[in-house]
Interface confidence: medium
């Protein structure tokens, strides 16, 4: 079977003139996925980003994360890949609190 | 920095448990699974198996029925339990990390300890 | 299981030189699950390439990686002498998670 994940972009004060991004994946089922943040198109370095690790989320599903940090008011540049069971989208940041997409494919 | 320390007996008896542990410091237990692999003298790399940051357990099927992987976060160990060992399982054994961005490579590795099985 | 076919299985070539390595998969792989890990004798191995392309922390640009589905390739662009090494693909795409046989590749 195949799950598609649920995909979450989120975003937080940092420190000044900064914002922390995160993107989250959920309930996708089997566990391989890879999440990245990408600017421009251009997947970031890995130095750059942190990744949470898949977890099981208890209803045979998985979840994980991964965060950036980024300059405010340069949101628009940077989307979350997102790449499942063959199947990939992108996911911008939310000019707003939170932004929740389903990836349909 | 990130190290991890394989260690146990140099030397099992054929029949016998083979026991490793593997130590790690520079990163956390619950945040970072592990992965074991060995290495036959002169030969390739083969995934016994890994433990995942919630304790649950992926093993090769080539060794599921004598294999278990655990942890012990109060000590910083992973440890490596491989029951009925024969000759066949004189190897290198290696634990790594499993890396979270870097989709599931092994990103560090210990130094490796070599386990002879003779009698 | 996934079987990977690394060739050739010894490489001969002098420092300076380019050398590609090839690695074969009986079954399609994501490219985000194929990697690279060089070898020195005495060594563990060493993350050198990861998802097929991205060179691992520390790693010199010298260093690149390709292909998709059943065909990858790990390239070094001009050899240094402690880039003599065996070198192994590894596939984290389906479990078990296997490893090609690797590729001595050796001063000539």
């Known amino acids: 079977r195949t799950v598609p994940p649920m995909v979450n972009v989120t975003r937080s004060e940092a420190s000044e003139g900064n914002i922390t991004v995160t993107c989250r994946a959920s309930g996708f089922y089997p566990w391989n996925i890879t999440l990245s943040w990408r600017q421009d198109g251009v997947s970031l370095s890995h130095d750059t980003q942190q990744w949470g690790d898949v977890l099981p989320d208890g209803n045979g599903t998985y979840q994980t994360w991964v965060a950036t940090r980024i300059c405010q008011g340069e949101e628009q540049r940077f989307t979350c890949y997102m790449e499942h069971s063959g199947n990939h989208s992108t996911h911008p940041v939310p000019s707003g609190k939170v932004l929740v997409l389903q990836s349909h494919w | 920095q990130v190290q991890l320390q394989e260690s146990g007996p140099g030397l099992v008896k054929p029949s016998e448990t083979l026991s490793l542990t593997c130590t790690v410091s520079g990163f956390s237990l619950t945040t970072y699974g592990v992965h074991w692999i060995r290495q036959p003298p002169g030969k390739g790399l083969e995934w016994i198996g890994m433990?995942?940051?919630?304790?649950?357990?992926d093993y090769n099927a080539a060794f599921i029925s004598r294999v278990t992987i655990s942890v012990d976060t109060s000590k910083n160990q992973f440890s490596l339990k491989l029951s009925s060992v024969t000759a066949a399982d004189t190897a290198v054994y290696y634990c790594?990390?499993?890396?979270?961005?870097?989709?599931?490579?092994?990103?560090?590795w210990g130094q490796g300890t070599l386990v002879t099985v003779s009698s | 299981e996934i079987v990977l076919t690394q060739s050739p299985g010894t490489l001969s070539l002098s420092p300076g030189e380019r050398a590609t390595l090839s690695c074969t998969a009986s079954?399609?792989?994501?490219?985000?699950?194929l990697h690279w890990y060089q070898q020195k004798p005495g060594q563990a191995p060493r993350l050198l390439i990861y998802?097929?392309?991205n060179l691992a922390s520390g790693i010199p640009d010298r260093f690149s990686g390709s292909g998709s589905g059943t065909d990858f390739t790990l390239t070094i662009s001009r050899l240094e002498p402690e880039d003599f090494a065996v070198y192994y693909c590894h596939q984290y795409h389906r479990s078990p998670f296997t490893f090609g046989q690797g590729t001595k590749l050796e001063i000539k």
């Open positions: 790594a990390r499993k890396g979270h961005g870097y989709y599931y490579a092994m990103d560090y």
């Open positions: 079954s399609s792989v994501s490219s985000s699950y």
């Open positions: 998802s097929t392309s």
């Open positions: 433990i995942w940051t919630d304790a649950t357990t």
